[in-house]
């Protein structure tokens, strides 16, 4: 069947999700495409516990997550509600800063060196994290 019952090779399982941590950089859209071709998505952080898990694996390195406001409001790539969900922005962020001189503002979110979030220019080549959920069908205990 098409169910994913265990994580692919080189992915890390945590709380019924699988995570893959890049060691090279891409622009946000290209990182997003990479994850999608793995039948996954850029990581969606839904709790402090998940934040700490991801932070532990990426270390103090700028790393893309699946959060952007390229079409106006902030949105998670998997449809998770942003307004009511977990957030971990740095103070004064997001600020949609235009002073970088690269044109436009800042529409893509990343983990900073201390794990808190910042919005930045989507073209910057940061590392990224892919996430895919283990299928609900595989979460049910086997019948005895």
């Amino acid at each position: 069947g098409s169910e994913r019952t265990c994580c692919p090779v080189n992915w890390v399982e945590h709380e019924r999700s699988c995570y893959w941590f890049s060691r090279s950089g891409k622009a946000w859209a290209d990182a997003d495409n990479y994850c999608r071709l793995e039948d996954a998505h850029l990581v969606v952080v839904t709790s402090w516990e998940e934040q700490k898990f991801v932070q532990h694996h990426i270390g103090p390195v700028n790393t893309w997550m699946g959060l952007h406001d390229q079409n106006g409001p902030w949105k998670w790539v998997d449809g998770t509600d942003y307004e009511t969900g977990f957030k971990n922005w740095r103070p004064e962020q997001p600020d949609d800063w235009y002073g970088h001189g690269l044109g436009g503002g800042e529409d893509c979110a990343h983990f900073t060196d201390d794990g808190r979030w910042n919005d930045d220019v989507c073209q910057r080549p940061y590392r990224w994290v892919c996430e895919t959920e283990l299928d609900k069908a595989s979460q049910e205990p086997p019948l005895l």
Partner: antibody, heavy 120, light 108 residues
Framework: EVQLLESGGGLVQPGGSLRLSCAAS????????MNWVRQAPGKGLEWVSV????????YYADSVKGRFTISRDNSKNTLYLQMNSLRAEDTAVYYC?????????????WGRGTLVTVSS | DIQMTQSPSSLSASIGDRVTITCRAS??????LNWYQQKPGKAPKLLIF???SLQNGVPSRFSGSGSGTDFTLTISSLQPEDFATYYC?????????TFAPGTKVDIK
């Protein structure tokens, strides 16, 4: 043996349709994104399309978008390319290729190709 | 999309020669660069991935270098079986997985 084998090529009139197949063996087919790459006679390689391992994501070159559809049947270890509204410039050898992803992406396995000729 | 160019488009060389082929990207692609070899009537074959990593089974006379926008494929001592066309491919901004036009290596 690890291999890819394309089929379904042939002569078709402009505006016609054709479906190519690529049979995979020797590896866990559903674990890999798969590509179609084409090569017009005497020309270079042109990437055409890619589909993720479980079929959830697809991408196309601008030159074929809206005319070609990539799909796969993992139960049959087979990749497909449905080609509609064919044009003379689609004449090429079509290769399927397996994508390896380890941060850096590359195509480590290719089929031998199948020739598609679009002509009246 | 990122544009890829290769030079020269063709070259003539002798057995034992050191051959160098250059690939250039229209913007930085870090090390997301692969090299393929294709012989007439055959499918392409992966030689080098990630700019400098040699694919399993590929002779050590092939090597790749470079990062950013400029890359090089070197054949340290050309052998008879190396006469072919060589293509570079970027996978930084992808898809599309863009190929360069290729370099044909033939016998002098």
């Amino acid at each position: 043996e690890v291999q890819l084998l394309e089929s379904g090529g042939g002569l078709v009139q402009p505006g016609g349709s054709l479906r190519l197949s690529c049979a995979a063996s020797g590896f866990t087919f559903s674990s890999y994104a798969m590509n179609w790459v084409r090569q017009a006679p005497g020309k270079g390689l042109e990437w055409v399309s890619v589909i993720s391992g479980r079929g959830g994501s697809t991408y196309y070159a601008d030159s074929v978008k809206g005319r070609f559809t990539i799909s796969r049947d993992n139960s049959k270890n087979t990749l497909y390319l449905q080609m509609n509204s064919l044009r003379a410039e689609d004449t090429a050898v079509y290769y399927c290729a397996k994508r390896i992803a380890a941060g850096m992406e590359y195509f480590d396995l290719w089929g031998r190709g199948t020739l598609v000729t679009v002509s009246s | 999309d990122i544009q890829m160019t290769q030079s020269p488009s063709s070259l003539s060389a002798s057995i034992g020669d050191r051959v160098t082929i250059t690939c250039r990207a229209s913007q930085s692609i870090s090390s997301y660069l692969n090299w393929y070899q294709q012989k007439p009537g055959k499918a392409p074959k992966l030689l080098i991935f990630a700019a400098s990593s040699l694919q399993n089974g590929v002779p050590s006379r092939f090597s790749g270098s470079g990062s950013g926008t400029d890359f090089t494929l070197t054949i340290s001592s050309l052998q008879p079986e190396d006469f072919a066309t060589y293509y570079c491919q970027q996978t930084y901004s992808s898809p599309p997985f863009t190929f360069a036009p290729g370099t044909k290596v033939d016998i002098k």
